[in-house]
């Protein structure tokens, strides 16, 4: 999916109404220096692309996200905001109520949950400090 | 744990090509900006050449434009500099290195490789 | 180009500060970056965005940025900070990297 046409102010109003909240919930206990910064984006599009990948694309290590409420309130703000988005996540949505397992917060998930903390961070800051 | 390692350094003669690789792990290589960077024995850092995240654009220094290029394949995490027509002036240390990026601003370096000496003499 | 100067050699004693500049026109308004080098070693980034510090960096190492200069500040100075010290920044005008020629921290005693 092609992020260029999102309107990013309302994303941008939605994570840092609930779902910054939710990542920092499911990350209580842990340091963001805990894990160093494996992931990047460079721009807008570019960050959500990838914060899409990390929240929705199960890996081996932590395969479980997809279910958690920062990834199902990340869902409906890109299903909201991003047109013709719902209309690609339908056979992702599908298959993966096939595989769905009831999950154990692991070391590895807590790490992809701080990855995406920075990911979102970087989204929300439209500039660098400095030119 | 993130990890850049370079190699295909050596000696080769003044005029001839040398190409050098980087090979990066621990880390979503397709999200940063890469850069080469050398230093010449005894001298300071000079900046070579960056790579966009996406292989979109490159910038290079004056001192090697036209002359050498790089490139990035993102499917196999590796970056590479393709250096042509080499003078005595390229001997050094190549490094690459990563950094963030922000639309068309590059950030700090923040992981470097170990780094691959070329020397060129005849 | 841009044109970014350090002094060649700064000198501190065990315990105290250290002050390494990074002069260039009306540097504040550009992000600097800092490197430590130590011999036969690759560069290290000490400090980024003026004065923010990797999670691995100890915070004895600070940064500042106004005007026409750029610091690099260690405080109580140890053995092991021996290294050469390298600001650098991004100068978007010509789409290229800039370091600066390097300052040799020397701990005396």
């Known amino acids: 999916y092609d992020f260029t046409n999102c309107d990013f102010q309302k994303i941008e109003a939605d994570y840092l109404r609930t779902i910054s909240k939710d990542l920092i919930t499911y990350m209580s206990g842990t340091k963001s220096t805990d894990f160093n910064n494996t992931v990047s984006c460079s721009n807008r599009p570019h960050c959500l692309t990838e914060i899409q990948s990390l929240t929705f694309n199960p890996t081996p290590r932590c395969a479980s996200l997809a279910k958690e409420m920062f990834a199902r309130k990340t869902k409906a703000t890109l299903a909201l905001w991003c047109p013709g988005y719902s209309e690609t996540q339908i056979n992702a949505t599908q298959a993966m109520k096939k595989r769905r397992k009831r999950k154990v917060t692991t070391n590895k998930c807590l790490e992809q949950v701080s990855q995406l903390l920075g990911l979102w961070r970087r989204f929300i800051r439209t500039l660098l400090k400095k030119q | 744990q993130m990890q850049l390692v370079e190699s295909g350094g050596g000696v080769v003669q003044p005029g001839r090509s040398l190409r050098l690789s980087c090979a990066a792990s621990?880390?979503?290589?397709?999200?940063?900006?890469m850069h080469w960077v050398r230093q010449a024995p005894g001298k300071g850092l000079e900046w070579v050449a960056v790579v966009w995240y996406d292989g979109s654009y490159t910038h290079y220094a004056d001192s090697v434009k036209g002359r050498f290029t790089i490139t990035r394949d993102n499917s196999k995490n590796t970056l590479n500099l393709q250096m042509n027509s080499l003078r005595a002036e390229d001997t050094a240390v190549y490094y690459c290195?990563?950094?963030?990026?922000?639309?068309?601003?590059?950030?700090?370096?923040?992981?470097w490789g170990q780094g691959t000496m070329v020397t060129v003499s005849s | 180009s841009y044109v970014l100067t350090q002094p060649p050699s700064v000198s501190v004693a065990p315990g105290q500060t250290a002050r390494i500049t990074c002069g260039g026109n009306?540097?504040?308004?550009?992000?600097v970056h800092w490197y430590q080098q130590k011999p036969g070693q690759a560069p290290v980034l000490v400090v980024y965005d003026d004065s923010d510090r990797p999670s691995w960096i100890p915070e004895r190492f600070s940064g500042s940025n106004s005007g026409n200069t750029a610091t690099l500040t260690i405080s109580r100075g140890e053995a092991g900070d021996e290294a050469d010290y390298y600001c650098?920044?991004?100068?978007?005008?010509?789409?290229?990297?800039?370091f600066g020629g390097g300052t040799k921290l020397t701990v005396l005693g």
């Open positions: 009306n540097i504040g308004s550009k992000s």
């Open positions: 621990g880390f979503t290589f397709r999200t940063y900006g």
């Open positions: 650098q920044i991004w100068d978007s005008s010509s789409s290229l990297v800039v």
């Open positions: 290195a990563r950094s963030p990026q922000w639309e068309e601003i590059f950030e700090a370096m923040d992981i």
